[in-house]
Amino acid sequence: VPAQVVLTPYKPEPGYECQISQEYYDRKAQMCCAKCPPGQYVKHFCNKTSDTVCADCEASMYTQVWNQFRTCLSCSSSCTTDQVEIRACTKQQNRVCACEAGRYCALKTHSGSCRQCMRLSKCGPGFGVASSRAPNGNVLCKACAPGTFSDTTSSTDVCRPHRICSILAIPGNASTDAVCAPESPTLSAIPRTLYVSQPEPTRSQPLDQEPGPSQTPSILTSLGSTPIIEQSTKGG
């Protein structure tokens, strides 16, 4: 459809309404009149012969939608010291603040900005940071599954795989890595200790769950911390 020519004010025919996206019905004038575009407000309402008169929002005020507001809305107050301004206050949009690194938003505004930031929770030894976040954006901790461990208290570290030994000295558990025995001179043909690459911490969309001591399926936690041992069958 070609671009429409604005022809407000006009009288809607019986049974019809004004075009709600950019027009409103003025009861006094009984006409469909133009709304004001984002960044403006109504200075004078329409009458039968003249259309709405719009004016720009003043500093620190905005309108984000086509509107028939008598005043613009006030922008939110400046971002706090633990926040970063990700969208400035303009005539057409409100200021948006986000939490700085290491913090999550504990209290959001209806416009998506953050009102209160909190320090991210830390996961202790035996627990790693889950790939998903809590609904509020805080870290979720999950018990390290068999074959993985975490020996730190951190808001970023994930459970890492135990190292794989040719000869195992001490099995790993949820909070400590496996310890490999030194190579025996008689078994020089056996490959050196193998280390499994450690994945980087990952972040994904929050799941509908709250932080708890364990977020792993019960079938895994019931297996205990039996290490995965790769023994060599090569001999002399």
């Epitope: 459809v1 020519v5 022809l7 004010p9 006009y10 019986p14 049974g15 075009q19």
Partner: antibody, heavy 120, light 112 residues
Framework: EVQLLESGGGLVQPGGSLRLSCAAS????????MSWVRQAPGKGLEWVST????????WYADSVKGRFTISRDNSKNTLYLQMNSLRAEDTAVYYC?????????????WGQGTLVTVSS | QSVLTQPPSASGTPGQRVTISCTGS?????????VHWYQQLPGTAPKLLIY???NRPSGVPDRFSGSKSGTSASLAISGLRSEDEADYYC???????????FGGGTKLTVLG
């Protein structure tokens, strides 16, 4: 393709009745207001009646008020005009037309028309 | 007599600009209702040419334009062509009659 097809016209005696139908296709019929417009031989267009999409509101020209009834069956995508107590001056080609639904309601789709002749 | 008054005829030569007027009253055009224009080529059904005073449906050449002021409206056709030879009707809602009204129609002739 958006289409309107009128039927039901013909020769009828003064005082008689006739029911015109308009079959709609190619669009969501219930979302649009519909009208009947007529044109007497060699004359201009004359609006007859309008009905909104739901069928709840109707309007009639003074010349047909009390004699003609506009109706619609949205399940059948069909518009009707029941014409009673017909007069010689009702002789015309009758068009059904769709009102475009959003931009100021001009009649953007028309049928080819059906001729109604009222004569003894 | 029609509620909306149009000149019965208008004419022009190819390439010329022709204007057709449509005069109403305070109960229709003057009340603020929009005006639509229809073109009816010989032996065919009418076709929406201009809606909402000045908007062209897709497919209508930009040679056709509409405007409205006070109680009257007008249709302008520039660069007149032989295929523009047709009857032209204006239409609007009328408060007094509580219904739609058409102008009497203007027969446009494209000369020689």
């Amino acid at each position: 393709e958006v289409q309107l097809l009128e039927s039901g016209g013909g020769l009828v005696q003064p005082g008689g009745s006739l029911r015109l139908s308009c079959a709609a296709s190619g669009f969501t019929f219930s979302s649009y207001a519909m009208s009947w417009v007529r044109q007497a031989p060699g004359k201009g267009l004359e609006w007859v009646s309008t009905i909104i999409g739901s069928g709840a509101n109707t309007w009639y020209a003074d010349s047909v008020k009390g004699r003609f009834t506009i109706s619609r069956d949205n399940s059948k995508n069909t518009l009707y005009l029941q014409m009673n107590s017909l007069r010689a001056e009702d002789t015309a080609v009758y068009y059904c037309a769709r009102h475009e639904g959003y931009y100021y309601y001009g009649m953007d789709v028309w049928g080819q028309g059906t001729l109604v002749t009222v004569s003894s | 007599q029609s509620v909306l008054t149009q000149p019965p005829s208008a004419s022009g030569t190819p390439g010329q600009r022709v204007t057709i007027s449509c005069t109403g009253s305070s109960s229709n055009i003057g009340a603020g209702y929009v005006v639509h224009w229809y073109q009816q080529l010989p032996g065919t059904a009418p076709k929406l040419l201009i809606y909402g005073n000045s908007n062209r449906p897709s497919g209508v050449p930009d040679r056709f334009s509409g405007s409205k002021s006070g109680t009257s409206a007008s249709l302008a056709i520039s660069g007149l062509r032989s295929e523009d030879e047709a009857d032209y009707y204006c239409a609007a809602w009328d408060d007094s009659l509580n219904g739609r009204v058409f102008g009497g129609g203007t027969k446009l002739t494209v000369l020689g």
